[in-house]
């Protein structure tokens, strides 16, 4: 018989790590005894059921170091269904891992702290309803050195009170280095805390004033976070209660003796003013975050940066004035100061010119790297005052309210009425797209010398005097506008530098052969969801362009419905990678051989992405005439019913083939040619419920493979033959495999268990009724004892 | 040396209104809070409110909330309480008294006498 | 609110002498205790704060002890210009004075 996994229903992962998370459990499992219990040292139990743990449950794991019992229990005001849950935990429950370094018990009802190993380091009791801290409830845990109790008394969680922490309760805890007590209704820093803090995070409570006693001793504190004790509640994403002064008040010496702090948050604080003397004496700081107060004013002429010769990173976003936009805005001459400031974020502070003056102080600083200045309602901005900045490599100006080049008219008054805010900004990064090689289909322009960022603006035309002095440029991103003019070699003249240009989500007409031509450094341009001119009947459209940007490794035209009237073939010899996923080719391959050649004109071509293209076939000439440099293709969630996989040959060296999302009912039609470099081989989430003997076996290079979320009975070592114990990834998950007694598949699946990921979990039965939806190794199917089973043999 | 001086004494009568100040040197009148007391005669000592110059904010006793109300002018250094509808109730010393946490430092106090 | 009771509300002692005068509050005040001597005439007097801390320039025949809900103030070695009202402070929430204690020479 196959060894059965050694400890199910959980999974082992590297490392010593027993994942049985998510697995419905009540009680903490016992291990078989084959199961090597002395050499696990991390085990997790998060989103599990078990309400109850007893003294007995972790003798077994005596070398436990790391232990997850997160989301067990919740508390009623966290609980999905806001159910009432008391967690009890026997006296002697977690002595008996005298290793044990690391424990959460977060969000889970309990009330007390249990007795804990003197060898722990690290501990989590956030989101619970334990609301006093005392001398008793850490006694002897002197090796702790990080202590996180967040959440236990705000409106998810409400208390009646505040958590209580007593004066001196920590102080045995000589190691301490971390403590986190956010969200606890406290009104004041606990007391006598251990002088060896680095880390004291107390931000959102209700501590709406702070002296240098409730420091005091605290002289090691590297990072310290008193945010959102006193909020701007028109700035809340959440339940905000309105703080009962003006602003938090801070004494001018609270942090004098702070000599070794690094990191000084005071967000969402209500501040109005910044007093110099505040940051007198940290001379060490290197981030600062002041973002979500009133500093509006304050910015403009404060002189309390004058001494931060070592700030790295200062946040001042969203200072602006309830219902209020300025015309303008100038930073006060003590930002001058900040001779190491890498990155300065000034969004949301709502002001509409950005000139020469605006910044003028920063233009000095020969570190700063980093200039946020999104969601200001900008509509007149003089790009060309970057060229000043020395070191200047990301401004980010997305979400704002720019439309073209303009000159800067004066204008008058302060303000122009109600605007709020309506959005958060969000993560405008694209995901990385998995790839044989490292050519990432979208170049990361963090590693690029100088980006600009002005998606989510109101440009309609792009001209070139926008651009003007940024030759430097390398990165432009211009995604979600309204730019729907057609581009004819002349818009983006200056910027001669530049690689890598996003233009996505537009309405460009490409039309012109010369389109993007004055790019001679152009290397990867994003012209996806720019589909409403393609969709204009009638109306052509020419890709010749392409052929023209000899130094263009990745293009996008993902997403543009194209179905007719372009080119009849793209070409280029540069060209890496070509995302095309999201288009018309079942329409663009059916108009007879009009088509068929269209890609065939990329003759360096590696990364290919046809998904999403309503293609019903896929003939072996369409394959044959696709360049033959390719590594990576993928056809995902097209209308593929059949595949010729014999013409794979005519793709010598394809590595990837994803086919996932498509309506293959069976891998039949021969079997995977000999000689292909197929390296990974994704058919999830088709319909497959059977496979030829020995499909895959010809393709010696086959390490992945991804079957799941097919309509598979059986998984058989004879699709595989000799190749079974190469596959490093076979994925079988979400099949309804049929677990009668003896089932083939069982021996088999246990033999490559190395290479089934989620094999004790996610590996489920379809058939008979009663495992349906249970894990194959709910009943042990290799020896008949039940007898429906048997019957069903 | 931190000093408050307070207004002389004030002879009132029923119903009306008053205002006594608090003149404070030494030391940065923004960055501290500024309370006031109440000693009526035979009594003990009773909390009336504060005022936190750097930003106007005030917080009052209830008992007190109404007819109390505390203002500060930065540019003298000066805090005041008005007082209003006064009774016979209302005659007692009242100080003035510097804090942070706990009040460190205090005026000689205000009499007032409410009589008709 | 939090009350303070403070007892006894007079007491007489002999020069060189010591007393005791504590106040109890209404719930745990976590140290936030202050005492002050107040002398007629004058301003109250800043003693001790955060429940034993002397503040500079007071004599340490004065100290202070406590937590929780109960806190004292001693005076030992009892001198003439001791005589006065004392008074305890809670700030642990908002300021709430005791009734005071009246201290007499014999």
């Known amino acids: 018989l196959g060894t059965l996994p050694a400890f199910l229903p959980c999974e082992l992962k590297p490392h010593g790590l027993v994942d049985c998370n998510w697995l419905f459990l009540k009680s903490v499992p016992r291990f078989s005894a084959a199961a090597s219990c002395s050499n696990i040292t991390r085990l997790s139990l998060i989103s599990n059921r078990i309400h109850h743990l007893h003294n007995s449950d972790f003798v077994h794991l005596s070398n436990l170091r790391q232990l997850n019992l997160k989301w067990n229990c919740p508390p009623t005001g966290l609980s999905p269904l806001h159910f009432s849950c008391h967690m009890t935990i026997e006296p002697r429950t977690f002595l008996a891992m005298r290793t044990l370094e690391e424990l959460n018990l977060s969000y889970n009802g309990i009330t007390t702290v249990p007795r804990l190993p003197s060898s722990l380091v690290n501990l989590s009791l956030s989101h619970t309803n334990i609301l006093v801290l005392d001398a008793n409830s850490l006694a002897g845990l002197y090796s702790l050195r990080v202590l996180f109790m967040d959440g236990n008394c705000y409106y998810k969680n409400p208390c009646t009170g505040a958590v209580k922490v007593t004066p001196g309760a920590l102080l045995g805890l000589s190691n301490l280095t971390h403590l986190s007590l956010k969200y606890n209704n406290l009104t004041k820093v606990p007391r006598q805390l251990p002088p060896s803090l680095e880390y004291l995070l107390v931000s959102y409570n209700l501590i709406v004033k702070l002296g240098p006693e409730d420091l005091a001793n605290l002289t090691s504190l590297r990072v310290l976070d008193v945010g959102g004790n006193c909020r701007r509640c028109d700035h809340a994403p959440n339940p905000c209660i309105e703080c009962g002064q003006k602003s938090l008040h801070l004494h001018p010496e609270t942090f004098h003796h702070l000599s070794h702090l690094e990191g000084l948050v005071l967000k969402d604080s209500s501040l109005h003013t910044l007093n110099s003397s505040w940051f007198q004496g940290l001379v060490n700081l290197s981030v600062l975050d002041l973002s979500e107060n009133f500093l509006y004013e304050s910015i403009t002429h404060t002189n309390a940066f004058q001494n931060l010769t070592r700030l790295r990173k200062l946040n001042l976003s969203f200072n602006y004035r309830k219902k209020v936009s300025f015309a303008r805005l100038h930073l006060a001459p003590s930002f001058g100061s900040l001779v190491a400031l890498k990155e300065l974020d000034m969004h949301g502070i709502f002001f509409r010119s950005l000139d020469e003056t605006t910044l003028r102080p920063l233009a000095r600083l020969p570190m700063l790297q980093t200039l946020r200045l999104q969601m200001n309602f900008i509509n007149q901005a003089q790009l060309g005052i970057f060229r000043a900045f020395p070191g200047l490599r990301y401004v980010d100006l997305s979400d704002n309210r720019i439309s073209g080049a303009s000159e800067l008219t004066a204008t008058m008054g302060e303000a122009d009425g109600g605007e709020k805010v309506w959005l958060q900004p969000g993560d405008l990064a694209p995901a990385p797209v998995d790839t044989p090689s490292s050519e990432d289909f979208r170049p990361n322009c963090s590693t690029l010398n100088f980006t600009l960022d002005l998606s989510r603006n109101n440009l309609v035309t792009v001209q070139p005097e926008m651009f003007a002095q940024l030759s430097h440029l390398q990165c432009l991103r211009l995604s979600h506008n309204c730019i729907s003019q057609a581009v004819n070699g002349s818009q983006f003249l200056p910027l001669t530098g530049l690689q890598v240009l996003d233009l996505s989500h537009n309405k460009l007409d490409l039309y012109h052969e010369h389109s993007f031509t004055e790019l001679p450094r152009l290397e990867a341009l994003d012209l996806s969801y720019n589909s409403q001119p393609f969709g204009m009947q009638g109306v052509g459209h020419n890709f010749s362009f392409v052929a023209h940007l000899r130094t263009l490794r990745h293009l996008s035209l993902a997403h543009n419905n194209i179905h007719s009237q372009v080119s009849q073939q793209l070409c280029s010899t540069s060209l890496r990678a070509l995302d095309f996923s999201g288009n018309a080719l079942g329409h663009m391959w059916a108009e007879g051989d009009l088509y068929l050649h269209f890609f065939q004109g990329l003759s360096g071509l590696i990364w290919l992405d046809l998904s999403q293209n309503r293609l019903h076939t896929l003939l072996p000439q369409t394959l044959r005439n696709l360049p033959k440099s390719l590594q990576v293709l993928r056809l995902r969630d097209n209308y593929l019913a059949f595949f010729k996989w014999w013409s794979l040959h005519f793709l010598p060296k394809l590595e990837v083939l994803d086919l996932a999302g498509n309506q293959l009912k069976a891998l039949t039609n021969g079997s995977l040619p000999a000689g292909t470099r197929l390296r990974r081989l994704d058919v999830s989430c088709n319909s497959i419920s059977f496979v030829a003997p020995g499909f895959f076996s010809k393709a010696k290079e086959l390490r992945e493979l991804n079957l799941s979320a097919n309509a598979l009975k059986t998984v058989d070592h004879s699709w595989f033959g000799p190749l079974a114990s190469a596959l490093q990834i076979l994925d079988v998950s979400a099949n309804p495999l049929h677990c009668a007694c003896g089932a083939a598949f069982m021996d088999f699946l246990l033999e490559v268990q190395a290479a089934v990921p989620g094999l004790p979990s996610r590996v489920k039965c379809g058939s008979p009724g009663q495992l349906q939806g249970l894990s194959i190794f709910a009943q042990d199917l290799r020896l008949c004892l039940d007898e429906a089973l048997s019957w069903d043999c | 040396q931190v000093h408050l001086q307070q207004s002389g004494p004030d002879l009132v009568k029923p119903g009306a209104s008053v205002q006594m100040s608090c003149k404070t040197s030494?030391?940065?009148?923004?960055?501290?809070?500024l309370h006031w007391v109440r000693q009526r005669p035979g009594q003990g000592l009773e909390w009336i409110g504060w005022?936190?110059?750097?930003?106007?904010?005030?917080k009052y006793n209830d008992q007190f909330r109404g007819r109390t109300t505390l203002t500060a002018d930065k540019s003298s250094s000066t805090a005041y309480m008005f007082l209003s509808s006064l009774t016979s109730e209302d005659s007692a010393i009242y100080f003035c008294?510097?804090?942070?946490?706990?009040?460190?430092?205090w005026g000689q106090g205000t009499t007032l006498t409410v009589s008709s | 609110d939090i009350q303070m009771t403070q007892s006894p509300s007079s007491l007489s002692a002999s020069l060189g002498g010591k007393v005791t005068i504590t106040c109890k509050a209404s719930?745990?005040?976590?140290?936030?205790i202050a005492w002050y001597q107040h002398k007629p005439g004058k301003g109250p007097r800043l003693l001790i704060h955060?429940?034993?801390t002397l503040q500079p320039g007071i004599p340490s025949r004065f100290s202070g002890s406590g937590s929780g809900r109960d806190y004292s103030l001693s005076i030992s070695n009892l001198e003439p210009e001791d005589i006065a009202t004392y008074y305890c402070?809670?700030?642990?929430?908002?300021?709430?004075f005791g009734g005071g204690t009246k201290l007499e020479i014999k």
């Open positions: 030494d030391y940065t009148f923004t960055n501290y809070y």
């Open positions: 008294a510097k804090s942070w946490d706990y009040f460190d430092y």
């Open positions: 005022i936190y110059p750097g930003d106007g904010s005030t």
């Open positions: 955060y429940a034993s």
């Open positions: 402070l809670q700030y642990d929430d908002l300021y709430t």
């Open positions: 719930q745990d005040i976590d140290n936030y």
